[in-house]
Interface confidence: low
């Protein structure tokens, strides 16, 4: 225990605090009548060096002076920054069995004098806040260093505060606890920071400022917005501010946006009119304040106000399409489809659509409202019909969009030529075509329409379509396109009163089918065999089937089978073959082919024709 120095004393020259690179002499002296009993000459004083409570060196060889039995002086050099502990111990050499006895100890601190504090910055938060200054202390001193912040100003105003840095805390900011009021707006204040420790002292350069330089207004609060006459595009933003504020900055954006709209407002007095808001849009608003037009600092941004602008009546043109199906000789079913307006056009929650079907000459009108994006009606097959649709929200309805109902594929002369469908990547298909060769009226636009070729798709799923300008001959279709699914794609050419169409099948990605068609029956009629099959289940087709192959060979033959390749048609499920010998048993099977390859074979059927051979 070194704090009870009963046996002697330890002293340091020149001082227990020394600059980096200096040497020190440590003297260890025994008190009178202390030491090894009976044999003073056997007293041996040793000095041990500890860093972070760990013994790092025995300084036995660093003795520079020795009064045998009474005192020893050791020279220590190359001390590292921070604190080092030295302990003097007494070793009674005639008794090797006893450990050395602690005499006393001393701590030596190695450090540097403080550098002049720099970059002083002072702020007062709000008109009622207090002045606080911060600075850069420079290099670490490794010693306890006291800092004094002094402020002086008009009318003999002086004020100072102190703090210290050591190995546990850092002092680079002080709050003076005084408030500068706006009536001192033109006055100049000076602050200085002085640093002092055992190795020296230094002072900052004086830092001069005015009230306006350092006062940062509090951010505005109590933000709210009032929409004029429930307008969705105009609103008055209101807020509370400190009394001296002369300039505000407003920023606002739709919640899903990445860039702010910025507005500067002078002498707004807590109020500003915004005129370019989007109706029915979630917005975030924030405000910042400044006390002076040219000088001073902006406050932090206020807390966000988040609110949705009111609705306004929809604008824009609905994209309408339709399907016609004849029911019997005098009735047809019209199915109208339209795409939802985008949010900037809907400008609110669309409550319903107003749909009108009108026979132009007889002035027959069918009207209805629906919440869906499709509408089906049965109407007479005679007459010229036109349809219109408008979208309505709580504030009103959009202007109706009209479309003439024509026979979409009725005019062969308007059918586009050389329609092709190429897969571009996993989720789109490039459709190209050539214009009709001998159209007797101008093409006003093309419509590319597509739907998955799966059972019930016409009734279950609405079509997808794209409107294409009349001088474009291609479309990249991507909406609802999935890989390994075959789509029927129609290109319609529409004039004012007629329509022509061409059809093709296409897929965005394909594989060979999972299985082959299932032969259900083989029948013999007039010396020909009719093979009947069921189509491959839709999920197993894995793209557009280009053709089916029928294979056959004699039952026990090892020869290559013969085959017949049939162009795929959805509506076809049987095919004749006529090159089989009578009274010979054959094995037959089928496969299906996509652009990626051939399926495994379907089921095998045996058959023995009875008629005479061709």
């Amino acid at each position: 225990n070194i704090d009870v120095c009963k046996l002697g004393t330890v002293t340091v020259q020149p001082a227990p605090v020394i600059p980096l690179g200096s040497a020190a002499n440590i003297s260890c002296s025994l008190n009178p009548k202390q030491g090894c009993s009976h044999y003073p000459s056997s007293n041996e004083l040793i000095l041990l060096k500890f860093v972070n409570d760990v013994l790092v060196e025995n300084l036995h060889g660093k003795k520079v002076h020795d009064h045998t039995g009474h005192s020893s002086t050791f020279q220590v050099t190359n001390l590292s920054l921070g604190m080092t502990l030295f302990v003097c111990k007494l070793n009674c050499s005639n008794s090797q069995k006893k450990p050395p006895v602690p005499v006393c100890g001393v701590e030596i601190s190695v450090g540097v004098a403080p550098e002049p504090p720099q970059n002083i910055s002072c702020v007062q938060e709000g008109e009622n806040g207090t002045v606080a200054c911060s600075w850069n202390s420079g290099k670490v001193t490794y010693l306890k260093t006291n800092y004094t912040l002094q402020l002086s100003g008009p009318n003999n105003l002086t004020c100072q505060k102190q703090c210290f840095s050591d190995n546990r805390q850092n002092c680079n900011r002080l709050d003076l606890g005084i408030n500068l009021s706006p009536d001192l707006a033109e006055s100049r204040f000076i602050v200085r920071v002085t640093a002092i420790n055992d190795l020296g002292n230094s002072s900052s350069l004086p830092h001069t400022f005015t009230f306006l330089d350092i006062v940062i207004p509090l951010p505005p609060w109590d933000i709210r917005i009032n929409f004029l006459n429930a307008s969705g595009s105009r609103g008055t933003l209101q807020w509370e501010d400190e009394g001296q504020v002369v300039l505000n900055q407003l920023r606002y954006q739709p919640l899903n946006s990445t860039s702010w709209n910025m507005v500067n407002a002078t002498n707004a007095k807590g109020k500003y009119d915004l005129r370019d808001l989007r109706p029915f849009t979630e917005y975030e608003f924030q405000i910042s304040s400044k006390l002076h037009l040219s000088g001073g600092s902006w406050s932090n941004w206020s807390e966000s106000l988040r609110t949705r602008t009111p609705e306004e009546e929809p604008v824009g043109i609905l994209d309408i399409w339709y399907m016609k199906q004849d029911i019997d000789y005098d009735r047809q079913q019209i199915s109208l489809f339209w795409k939802s307006l985008n949010p900037s056009e809907a400008r609110g929650k669309i409550l319903h659509y107003q749909v009108t079907l009108q026979e132009v000459t007889k002035k027959t009108t069918l009207q209805n409202t629906t919440r869906h994006t499709s509408w089906t009606r049965v109407i007479p097959r005679t007459g010229a019909w036109t349809a219109s649709v408008s979208a309505a929200n709580s504030k009103g309805a959009s202007a109706p969009t009209h479309i003439n109902i024509v026979d979409l594929c009725g005019t062969g002369l308007l059918a586009p030529h050389q329609v092709s469908a190429k897969s571009e990547n996993m989720d789109n298909i490039l459709v190209t075509w050539q214009p009709p060769k001998k159209a007797d009226s101008a093409v006003r636009e093309y419509i590319v329409e597509w739907r998955a070729l799966q059972p019930g798709s016409i009734t279950k799923f609405p079509p997808h379509w794209l409107r294409i300008p009349p001088d474009n001959m291609s479309a990249l279709i991507s909406e609802n396109i999935k890989p390994y699914i075959c789509y029927e794609i129609r290109v319609h050419a529409l004039s004012e009163s007629q329509g022509g169409c061409s059809s093709i099948r296409g897929d965005s990605k394909h594989k060979a089918p999972v299985s082959g068609p299932h032969i259900t029956a083989i029948t013999e009629k007039k010396e020909r065999l009719f093979i009947s099959w069921t189509h491959i289940p839709f999920p197993e087709q894995r793209g557009c089937i280009l053709h089916y192959r029928i294979y056959w060979k004699e039952r026990d033959s090892t020869a290559q089978p013969e085959l017949c390749e049939i162009q795929y048609r959805r509506s076809q499920n049987s095919h004749p073959i006529s090159s089989l010998q009578p009274r010979v048993t054959y094995v037959l099977w089928m496969t299906a082919v996509t652009a990626a390859g051939e399926s495994p074979q379907g089921n095998e059927r045996e058959f023995c024709p009875q008629g005479k051979a061709n």
Partner: nanobody, 120 residues
Amino acid sequence: QVQLQESGGGLVQAGMSLRLSCAASGLTFSWYRMGWFRQAPGKEREFVAGWYGVLTQYRDSVKGRFTISRDDAKNTVYLQMNSLKPEDTAVYYCAASLGGNYRSYEYDYWGQGTQVTVSS
């Protein structure tokens, strides 16, 4: 009062580039679909390029050469025209619509036009 002001036209040689700008004022620009049309002497006005929200559309003859872009903060729509050809010579018009596609009658506001001449 709504105004659309085109700029950036001029006389260039074939294969060169031009960038047309159209500055809009008096309308809430971000709501509007913007389009570029052109009209050559003795011909009908024809659609060149359009920007509808996330969808851009081009006439076939300019695909890969022309690019439409817009800056809602500056209320401006641009048409970058590269690899210009003599057949691109026309007066180019900027137009704004609340819901139109490529049909000129669907556009509500039109600029005065800027002349682009491409010499061979």
